[in-house]
C-alpha cells in the first residue's frame, strides 16, 4: 500500500502479512497486507486491528477489527464507546456510510481515525497529537512502526522509476512490481481516470496511476481520492496536504 | 511502577526535550532535574528492579553533572500538561477533564501539534 508517514514522507510499500502501523502507550494499530495479484510485489490492506488501551477513568481496553467485506460500526465486544468508566464517551465509533466508512474519535488522546473499505481493500487515516505519537515506552522497539518510521528500505517500491518506464512507449516488463500488467489499462487511460478525481498531479495522483497500471482495478482511483479527502480533514497543515515528487532522496531518508 | 510519569513530567517541564538548556535556563533546568530526582526516589520501592527506573536514575546523575546542578536547591512544577502513563500503570483520576485531551492541554499550553498518517491503495 501507499503510506504517508507522520513526518509527511510518502512511500509505496510491499510489506506483506501483519505489520504494526502505530504502537504507543495508548494505541496499537496493526495492518495485514496481501498481494493484489498472484505473484505481485504490490500489496493492499486486507485487515486492520486497532487496540485502544485501557486509560484512566476514561476507557476500558477496546479492540476494533475490520476485514475485507466487513467494516463493523462497533468494537469487537459490540460496544460503540469506551465502556463503563466515567469518561467512556471520550471514545466513540460513528458509522458514516454503512459497510464503507467508519470514524473513530478518541478524545482522551486527541485522536481521530478514519477507516474505509474501497473496493475490496481497506484504507486508514489518523490525526494524532505529537505527544501521543511519541509516547512510547520501549524506545528501542520503535524501528518498524510504519506511521512513525516508514517502511524498511527493502520493502519499498520505487514507483517513480515504475512511472518513468510506464511513460515510455514500450510497456513495462521486468521493471514492473506486477508480473502481469493488465492490458486493459494503457498508461493514457490510467492518467485520464486519475485526473478526473485528482486534478492536482501530486503523489496521491501518482499513486493512483501506479495502482491502475498494476491492477487494472478502477476502485484504486477512489482509494487515492478518499485518502486525499481524509488528509484534508485530518492534516493540521493544509499547505502540506499535497505532497510532490522530490528529487531523488537518499536511501533511508525516511526516519 | 510510575517511573514513566516522572519521565514525562520532566520532559514536559524542560519542554526543549533532549536539547541542552541555554545558559540562562540552567537554574530552571536544574530545578526540573531535582524534581525529576525526587519523583524517581518516590517510585524507588516499586520500580527499583525495573530497567526504566535505573535508566532514569543514571540519566539524572549524568545530567546533574553535565550542568553542574547541586543536589540541594529549589524544585519546579511541570509547565505543561503531560499524558499520564497508560497500560500497566493506571493513575486514578476523578476528573472527567482528563478524558478530553484538548481541554486538558489548553489549560497549560498552546494548542497541541497534530500529525497525520495514512495508508491506502496498493
Amino acid at each position: 500500500p501507499h503510506l504517508r508517514t507522520f513526518t509527511d514522507h510518502f512511500q509505496t510499500c510491499k510489506v506483506q502479512g501483519a505489520w504494526p502501523l502505530i504502537d504507543n502507550n495508548y494505541l496499537n494499530v496493526q495492518v495485514t497486507n496481501t498481494p493484489v495479484l498472484p505473484g505481485s510485489a504490490a500489496t493492499a490492506t486486507s485487515k486492520l486491528t486497532i487496540i485502544f488501551k485501557n486509560f484512566q477513568e476514561c476507557v476500558d481496553q477496546k479492540v476494533y477489527q475490520a476485514e475485507m467485506d466487513e467494516l463493523p460500526s462497533a468494537f469487537a465486544d459490540g460496544s460503540k464507546n469506551g465502556g463503563d468508566k466515567h469518561g467512556a464517551n471520550s471514545l466513540k465509533i460513528t458509522e458514516k456510510v454503512s459497510g464503507q466508512h467508519v470514524e473513530i474519535q478518541a478524545k482522551y488522546i486527541g485522536t481521530t481515525i478514519v477507516v474505509r473499505q474501497v473496493g475490496r481493500y481497506l484504507t486508514f487515516a489518523v490525526r494524532m497529537p505529537e505527544e501521543v505519537v511519541n509516547a512510547v515506552e520501549d524506545r528501542d522497539s520503535q524501528g518498524l512502526y510504519l506511521c512513525l518510521r516508514g517502511c524498511p528500505l527493502n520493502q519499498q517500491i520505487d514507483f517513480q522509476a515504475f512511472r518513468a518506464n510506464a511513460e515510455s512507449p514500450r510497456r513495462p516488463a521486468a521493471a514492473s512490481p506486477s508480473p502481469v500488467v493488465p492490458e486493459t489499462f494503457p498508461y493514457e487511460t490510467a492518467v485520464a481516470k486519475c485526473k478526473e478525481k485528482l486534478p492536482v498531479e501530486d503523489l496521491y495522483y501518482q499513486a493512483c496511476v501506479f495502482d491502475l497500471l498494476t491492477t487494472g482495478d478502477v476502485n484504486f482511483t477512489l482509494a487515492a481520492y478518499y485518502a486525499l479527502e481524509d488528509g484534508k480533514m485530518l492534516h493540521s497543515n493544509k499547505d502540506k496536504l499535497h505532497l510532490f515528487e522530490r528529487t531523488r532522496e537518499l536511501p533511508g531518508a525516511v526516519a | 511502577c510510575k517511573i514513566l510519569k516522572c519521565n514525562s513530567e520532566f520532559w514536559s517541564a524542560t519542554s526543549s526535550g533532549s536539547h541542552a538548556p541555554a545558559s540562562d535556563d540552567v537554574p530552571e533546568f536544574c530545578a526540573a532535574l531535582r524534581t525529576y530526582a525526587l519523583c524517581t526516589r518516590r517510585t524507588a520501592r516499586t520500580c527499583r528492579g525495573d530497567l526504566a527506573y535505573h535508566s532514569a536514575v543514571h540519566g539524572i546523575e549524568d545530567l546533574m553533572s553535565q550542568h553542574n546542578c547541586s543536589k540541594d536547591g529549589p524544585t519546579s512544577q511541570p509547565r505543561v500538561r503531560t499524558l499520564p502513563p497508560a497500560g500497566d500503570s493506571q493513575e486514578r483520576s476523578d476528573s472527567p477533564e482528563i478524558c478530553h485531551y484538548e481541554k486538558s492541554f489548553h489549560k497549560h499550553s498552546a494548542a497541541p501539534n497534530y500529525t497525520h498518517c495514512g495508508l491506502f491503495g496498493d
Epitope: - | K2, R42, R45, T46, R48
Partner: antibody, heavy 115, light 112 residues
C-alpha cells in the same frame, strides 16, 4: 497480552531439590524486575523473593534465605527458582509475577515436599 | 518484618451492597520520600491473584471503578461500592515499602 507460565513443580522428598521455571511473553521481559510468591494449600500468600531486571540484586524472605536462589535468563525470557534443602512447609503453589511489585501473575505450579 | 492485619477475615455481603475491608500495618508504610506502597489483590476461587489497587488508591488496568482504595500511614481500606457475583474470593493487602515484602492474611468475601 502478558503471559507467565510456571513449570517444574512436582513431588520431592524432604532435603531434596527442585528447579522451577517461568516462561514470560507479551512484554519486554528484560526490562522488569520479577517476583516469586507461594501459597500453601488453603493458606494465604507468601512473598519469596525478587530479582532485578539485570540480576544485579536479589531479595529474599527470611524463610527461604540460603536455601532458594532466584535467577533469570533474559535471552530466553525465563525466570528460575532453584529450591534446595526442601522442607514439608515448602509445599505450596509457586507463582511468578511481573514487576518490582507484582502486577501480572502466572497460573502457578504445585510443589509437594513429602516422604 | 511488617505485619499486615486484615479485618474481617470473613465478609458475607448481599449482591449490590457495598463492602469494606480493613488492612492495618504494624508500622507506617510511608517511606522517607513520601511514597506509600500498599497494594490490594483479589484471588477468585481456583485462580491466580490479580492486582486491583496499587500505591494505596491507584486502580490497575482493567479494574472496574466499583473498587477503590484509601488510607495512609498504618490504616488502609479497600471498598467495593456494589458487590457483584464475580467479586467472590479472597482479598489480600500487600506492602512493598519495607523488606521483606509482606501480605495480609486475607479476607474471604462471600455472597449472603
Amino acid at each position: 497480552e502478558v503471559q507467565l507460565v510456571e513449570s517444574g513443580g512436582g513431588l520431592v522428598q524432604p532435603g531434596g531439590s527442585l528447579r522451577l521455571s517461568c516462561a514470560a511473553s507479551g512484554f519486554t521481559f528484560s526490562y522488569y524486575g520479577m517476583n516469586w510468591i507461594r501459597q500453601a494449600p488453603g493458606k494465604g500468600l507468601e512473598w519469596i523473593g525478587m530479582i532485578y531486571y539485570d540480576s544485579s540484586e536479589k531479595h529474599y524472605a527470611d524463610s527461604v534465605k540460603g536455601r532458594f536462589t532466584i535467577s533469570r535468563d533474559n535471552s530466553k525470557n525465563t525466570l528460575y527458582l532453584q529450591m534446595n534443602s526442601l522442607r514439608a512447609e515448602d509445599t505450596a503453589v509457586y507463582y511468578c509475577a511481573k514487576g518490582t511489585t507484582p502486577d501480572y501473575w502466572g497460573q502457578g505450579t504445585m510443589v509437594t515436599v513429602s516422604s | 518484618d511488617v505485619v499486615l492485619t486484615q479485618s474481617p477475615l470473613s465478609l458475607p455481603v448481599t449482591l449490590g451492597q457495598p463492602a469494606s475491608i480493613s488492612c492495618r500495618s504494624s508500622q507506617s508504610l510511608e517511606d522517607s520520600d513520601g511514597g506509600t506502597f500498599l497494594e490490594w489483590f483479589q484471588q477468585r476461587p481456583g485462580q491466580s491473584p490479580r492486582l486491583l489497587i496499587y500505591d494505596v488508591s491507584s486502580r490497575f488496568s482493567g479494574v472496574p471503578d466499583r473498587f477503590s482504595g484509601s488510607g495512609s500511614g498504618t490504616d488502609f481500606t479497600l471498598k467495593i461500592s456494589r458487590v457483584e457475583a464475580e467479586d467472590v474470593g479472597v482479598y489480600y493487602c500487600f506492602q512493598a515499602t519495607h523488606d521483606p515484602l509482606t501480605f495480609g492474611q486475607g479476607t474471604k468475601l462471600e455472597i449472603k
